[in-house]
Amino acid sequence: RQQWELQGDRRCQSQLERANLRPCEQHLMQKIQRDEDSYGRDPYSPSQDPYSPSQDPDRRDPYSPSPYDRRGAGSSQHQERCCNELNEFENNQRCMCEALQQIMENQSDRLQGRQQEQQFKRELRNLPQQCGLRAPQRCDLEVESGGRDRY
């Protein structure tokens, strides 16, 4: 079992090294910045989003409230690429968690304040599901300055 876990860890490590998680980071940062912008708006002003999908609200992908966000070509492309990258971890939930942790660590310095960090974490947890993938059951996304014992 120990040998198998060692092999699994090595496989995961090489997978993580090959992965390009930047699109996930870009997608999430854009998403939380967009959300902050929309929270800052007057809720009663009828602003029309020029990029919002012109389709029935109930015509949606399974697994998610609104995974295919067409609010901007760059944004949806980041999401598409991110989902493709995460799909490579679909058969290894432990490694999927490692990938999510890596995204969290890479962006932690750019998050301003506790509220933005919590929001980023929340979106990050939802990310696999938004891609139509299984989310890891237990995945600690806390970032500690002194590093973290992951398992």
Partner: antibody, heavy 113, light 102 residues
């Protein structure tokens, strides 16, 4: 897609799909074929890290590869027979929505001596 | 996929069905193909309209039974339509439905 239009039986069919404009990075790329007057058959797909998934019916004969520097995806099909005569398409294959949203124009391959 | 062909006139409502051999959730896409051309994605995840596709095309269904509807057939819609499951590998396509001019 590009490659020789005529391949002899028992030889290897080699096709290349060159993606213009956007980078192929972080996308899956599928190969699909269609014999004249028939339906579509999925051959397999490759991710830009090189990981592949092949159709079991062709697995023993198929090899796919990717060249990020040239923005190219390649398909090799060995030991071809007349049954491999078809139009071959490459398509961008998305995890989000599990759809093939961008297709190449296709290239006709005839297997004949 | 049924029917294998359908004859219709411009302005008609056309319905094509696709039945999966097992539950595929909503992982179904629809493509349109014209002679000598590559397939074009119309609908994905059973009911989501691909960007740039006219709203006269719609999809519905989940599990094993799916439908593609063209609400008012236009001259450019005469083509062959394929469904494709994205639930598992290998990806598989329906045998196609040819929409012909009556």
């Amino acid at each position: 897609e590009s490659g020789p239009g005529l391949v002899k039986p028992s030889e290897t069919l080699s096709l290349t799909c060159t993606v213009s404009g956007d980078s192929i990075r972080s996308y899956y790329w599928s190969w699909i074929r269609q014999p004249a007057g028939k339906g579509l058959e999925w051959v397999g797909r490759i991710f830009t890290t090189g990981s592949t998934t092949y159709n079991p019916s062709l697995k023993s004969r198929v090899t796919m590869s990717v060249d990020m520097s040239k923005n190219q995806i390649s398909l090799n099909l060995s030991s071809v027979t007349a049954a491999d005569t078809a139009v071959y398409y490459c398509a961008r294959d998305q995890t989000l929505g599990r759809r093939m949203d961008v297709w190449g124009q296709g290239t006709t391959v005839t297997v004949s001596s | 996929q049924s029917p294998s062909s359908v004859s219709a006139s411009v302005g008609d409502r056309v319905t094509i069905t696709c039945r999966a051999s097992q539950d595929i959730s909503s992982w179904l896409a629809w493509y349109q193909q014209k002679p000598g051309k590559a397939p074009k994605l119309l609908i994905y995840t059973a009911s989501s309209l691909q960007s740039g596709v006219p709203s006269r095309f719609s999809g519905s269904g989940s599990g094993t039974d799916f439908t593609l509807t063209i609400s008012s057939l236009q001259p450019e819609d005469f083509a062959t339509y394929y469904c494709q499951q994205g639930n598992s590998f290998p990806r598989t396509f329906g045998q196609g439905t040819k929409v012909e001019i009556k």
